[in-house]
């Protein structure tokens, strides 16, 4: 697994550097998760041809993966800090059930999958500290999540492989948009 944020060689080499600001810490945390996702995607793409498959739509129908849209206030046009922050936190909370699903999907990258899941929990905490309007953040229903997890795990092998690929791709895209939006805040 990669070295967690704040523990890379640059930080070790520069002990007198200013401590990271909250924004820098969040940025670094997202990039750490993105690096983890890249490693997981490598294993997925090497193991199957899902990354080149044109049948993604078949599996996508079963999923309700969070997506960033213009109305969420995270794009440069119509940027709205509060609305966007709520969207990012809500989206990450919704991704948690899918990250749980990924936990048993990797052989050589099991640790990496766990690191992505735990780092996302930390990221949510960082962002919740930053958010003022916590009332607007809806937490997914645990019962709904449990039944979704059961449903995903009951899929045939091909659909499970495709679901893994789609979760990783969508999570990567969501984080990249979040990264860009947070840099405007």
């Amino acid at each position: 697994a990669p070295v967690p944020p704040g523990e890379d060689s640059k930080d070790v080499a520069a002990p007198h550097r200013q401590p990271l600001t909250s924004s820098e810490r969040i940025d670094k945390q997202i990039r750490y998760i993105l690096d983890g996702i890249s490693a997981l995607r490598k294993e997925t793409c090497n193991k199957s041809n899902m990354c080149e498959s044109s049948k993604e739509a078949l599996a996508e129908n079963n999923l309700n993966l969070p997506k960033m849209a213009e109305k969420d206030g995270c794009f440069q046009s119509g940027f709205n800090e509060e609305t966007c922050l709520v969207k990012i936190i809500t989206g990450l909370l919704e991704f948690e059930v899918y990250l749980e699903y990924l936990q048993n999907r990797f052989e050589s990258s099991e640790e990496q999958a766990r690191a992505v899941q735990m780092s996302t929990k930390v990221l949510i905490q960082f962002l919740q500290k930053k958010a003022k309007n916590l009332d607007a953040i809806t937490t997914p229903d645990p019962t709904t999540n449990a039944s979704l997890l059961t449903k995903l795990q009951a899929q045939n092998q091909w659909l499970q492989d495709m679901t893994t690929h789609l979760i990783l791709r969508s999570f990567k895209e969501f984080l990249q948009s979040s990264l860009r939006a947070l840099r405007q805040m």
Epitope: E24, D27, R31, L34, S38, K67, M68, A69, E70, C74, F75, Q76, S77, K172, E173, F174, Q176, S177, L179, R180, R183, Q184
Partner: antibody
Framework: EVQLVQSGGGLIQPGGSLRLSCAAS????????MIWVRQAPGKGLEWVSD????????YYADSVKGRFTMSRDISKNTVYLQMNSLRAEDTGVYYC?????????????WGRGTLVTVSS | DIVMTQSPSTLSASVGDRVTITCRAS??????LAWYQQKPGRAPKVLIY???TLESGVPSRFSGSGSGTDFTLTISSLQPEDFATYYC????????FGQGTKLEIK
Amino acid sequence: EVQLVQSGGGLIQPGGSLRLSCAASGFTISSNYMIWVRQAPGKGLEWVSDLYYYAGDTYYADSVKGRFTMSRDISKNTVYLQMNSLRAEDTGVYYCARWADDHPRYIDHWGRGTLVTVSS
Amino acid sequence: DIVMTQSPSTLSASVGDRVTITCRASQGISSWLAWYQQKPGRAPKVLIYKASTLESGVPSRFSGSGSGTDFTLTISSLQPEDFATYYCQQSWLGGSFGQGTKLEIK
């Protein structure tokens, strides 16, 4: 092999409109970040806009915001720069390029550039 | 926009000299900075990215350093083919460039 073939430049009067095209081959624009950069005659490079492949999210330099629109057609693997309300200071060579890497780090491929001249 | 200020705008040097170009960002950009070389009539070519990572195929006489707001590009021993214009570019948000440094023969 990655290639970016540009077209659409030319002479245009102030206040006019022009659309630049950039046809990509060797990679898919639907999973890459694209960028337009311009260079006025004898001057430096100026970032104009970029398009994050995810959700087609676009960003613009203050100098072109509200006048220029960057878009894409995934089926044609082509990106566009629609330029409206053109001014003399928009004159220059416009480069279409691709950001490298997942969190853009640098430009790894450039088009040959297309000359836009805004003059009456 | 993030403003990138590059200096000097022109630099006269001789083959074998060690030269340094600096670039300052109007806000912190972590290490999201690249250096490019451009020759007349050509598209720019990347030399360094992530502030200090040398692009493959680029001679080791080129090096970059810095983080946050202040960055430098150093050419340890100038070669005849190094006389060109150099630009820094941030990729933290958008992709603004410095105004360029023209490196000319003394």
